[in-house]
Interface confidence: low
């Protein structure tokens, strides 16, 4: 067969769907690989062909579009399952071609089972809500295109196993779930079950997402450097190990990059010749505020090192701060014999 632009197996798009539920899967070629859409391709005389490789098999085979009740069908650039079965799991390929052009991509589709509490191996999207922040809503995800706007589905929301009704601060509003005031106790998995009729059959769509309540931007502050501070002096003799922790608190900020770094005499440690190591540890609060600690370590400090300026810097979307460590050379305790000699010399 003639050459075909093969984009390989697109593992970035690991598609997971629930068993015994409808699934509509768009050919990724038009979304991620090609610069034109399906309509343009179709009007240019290109044909979209689907085939698949079953789980644990190597053989590519055509998809059977002649199953009872049109269980699997194709509509434009969408592959439909009404509904899925467990053994539909495999790698699916869509190929766009005519006599002179060919492009194809494969993607994995996994049909997963869920229990009566909606637990499953499905990777769940995480939706972050700001704590005590006014009304915030989550929307039942990935249900567009399953039924026309003339169809009015019924939507039931669950937290874990429990149907949400008469909850204090959580109100189901159709496709939306409103949190009047988000609290830590609202952390958890939320499931919407959308039920709709189609051609005399009833289908269910189950969508679960994880809600994580995080620090509110109203309470966000610039980074706070707890250490080094004015109360601690790092007093060392040459030859000793110098350890200076830089401990910084960062308020949670959506999409903020938190950074901590040391400078020694105004330069990054990598840019100077002294043998310095830096170890970092990170911890998080329940609302995803972050504490970062970077320990600067010089195994055998010299008297020159003890004269340098050691500054801890921190930056987030709220601002940048810096704090110098107080480092000094320990004055050696006076030695008795030397003192006596000086004494005799003075008389």
């Amino acid at each position: 067969s003639e050459r075909c632009d093969d984009w390989g197996l697109d593992t970035m798009r690991q598609i997971q769907v629930f068993e015994d539920e409808p699934a509509r899967i768009k050919c990724p070629l038009f979304e991620h690989f090609l610069k034109f859409n399906y309509s343009t391709a179709h009007s240019a005389g290109l044909t979209l062909i689907w085939y698949w490789t079953r789980q644990d098999r190597d053989l590519e085979e055509p998809i059977n579009f002649r199953l009872p009740e049109n269980r699997i069908s194709k509509e434009k650039d969408v592959l439909w399952f009404r509904p899925t079965l467990l053994n539909d799991t495999g790698n699916y390929t869509c190929m766009l071609r005519n006599t002179t052009y060919c492009s194809k991509v494969a993607f994995p589709l996994e049909v997963v089972q869920k229990d009566s509490c909606f637990n499953s191996p499905m990777k769940l999207p995480v939706h972050k809500l700001y704590i005590e922040y006014g009304i915030q809503r989550i929307t039942c995800p990935n249900v567009d295109g399953y039924f026309p706007s003339s169809v009015k589905p019924t939507i039931t929301w669950y937290m874990g196993c429990y149907k949400i009704q008469n909850f204090n601060n959580v109100i189901p509003e159709g496709m939306n779930l409103s949190f009047l005031i988000a609290l830590i106790s609202n952390n958890g998995n939320y499931t919407c079950v959308v039920t709709y009729p189609e051609n005399g059959r009833t289908f269910h769509l189950t969508r679960t997402l994880t809600v994580k309540v995080v620090g509110s931007p109203k309470n966000a502050v610039p980074p706070v450097i707890h250490s080094p501070n004015d109360h601690v002096v790092y007093e060392k003799e040459p030859g000793e190990e110098l350890l200076i922790p830089c401990t910084v608190y960062f308020s949670f900020l959506m999409d903020s990059r938190n950074e901590v770094w040391w400078t020694i005499d105004g330069k990054k440690p990598d840019d100077i010749t002294i043998d310095v190591t830096i170890n970092e540890s990170i911890s998080h609060s329940r609302t995803e505020d972050e504490t970062r600690t970077q320990i600067l370590s010089i195994k055998k400090v010299t008297s020159e090192d003890l004269k340098r300026s050691y500054v801890c810097h921190a930056r987030s979307a709220k601002g940048e701060v810096a704090k110098a460590a107080k480092v000094k050379q320990k004055v050696p305790a006076p030695r008795y014999t030397v003192e006596l000699a000086c004494g005799f010399g003075a008389t």
């Epitope: 922040y133 006014g134 009304i135 109203k218």
Partner: antibody, heavy 120, light 108 residues
Framework: EVQLEESGGRLVQPGTSLRLSCAVS????????MSWVRQAPGKGLEWVST???????AYASWPKGRFTISKTNSKNTLYLQMNSLRAEDTAVYFC??????????????WGQGTLVTVSS | DVQMTQSPSSLSASVGDRVTITCQAS??????LSWYQQKPGQAPKLLIY???DLESGVPSRFSGSGSGTDFTLTISSLQPEDFATYYC??????????FGQGTKVVIK
């Protein structure tokens, strides 16, 4: 109908105190963040203070402790206590409801305002 | 605190004109910006939130754009009822609340 109605504005002397009220109807004060905004005659809008659902408060830097925002959820009423009033506090004071959605704190619903005049 | 600078402070325009008002923040406020319209003797009215989202009920001739420090309110075709004063407002985190000084749109 959802609405906000301010009251309590009047002519007062410098150095005195005044409490403004904002009666809300059509929604519960316990479900929304609320703000006070003022507008001096012929001037622009100036944010004064906000009280969040949980009762946390925030103020502009200029009142310097003279103003206090509070609310009584059971009465569905928002307040602004203004002490040590000055001539420059003369303004129409609006209460406003924050949008409460999508994390964007826009002032989506406003009262008609109440006029405070500070003059000797 | 964030300072908001609006320009121009006033502009004269005719019905049907395309009108652009700009607002600059003294530091990045991401997309945390609102636009309001105020007519004499009335309370302000929210037009745009989140820099570009149209408040429900607001005509589509109003649009907002920008993020970070530079923002724009555009009225694509000025109508008689649009002659008013327009304000931008920062809604960013602790500093939210700061308004621009206003832009008065008057009939040419």
């Amino acid at each position: 109908e959802v609405q906000l109605e301010e009251s309590g504005g009047r002519l007062v002397q410098p150095g005195t105190s005044l409490r403004l009220s904002c009666a809300v109807s059509g929604f519960s004060l316990s479900s929304y963040d609320m703000s006070w905004v003022r507008q001096a005659p012929g001037k622009g809008l100036e944010w004064v203070s906000t009280i969040y659902i949980g009762g946390t408060t925030a103020y502009a830097s200029w009142p310097k402790g003279r103003f206090t925002i509070s609310k009584t959820n059971s009465k569905n009423t928002l307040y602004l206590q203004m002490n040590s009033l000055r001539a420059e506090d003369t303004a129409v004071y609006f209460c406003a409801r924050l949008q409460g959605a999508n994390y964007y704190n826009s002032l989506a619903l406003w009262g008609q305002g109440t006029l405070v005049t500070v003059s000797s | 605190d964030v300072q908001m600078t609006q320009s121009p402070s006033s502009l004269s325009a005719s019905v049907g004109d395309r009108v652009t008002i700009t607002c600059q923040a003294s530091q990045s406020i991401y997309s945390f910006l609102s636009w309001y319209q105020q007519k004499p003797g009335q309370a302000p009215k929210l037009l745009i939130y989140a820099a570009s989202d149209l408040e429900s009920g607001v005509p589509s001739r109003f649009s907002g754009s920008g993020s970070g420090t530079d923002f724009t309110l555009t009225i694509s075709s000025l109508q008689p009822e649009d002659f008013a004063t327009y304000y931008c407002q920062s809604n960013y985190i602790i500093d939210y609340g700061a308004f621009g000084q206003g832009t008065k749109v008057v009939i040419k």
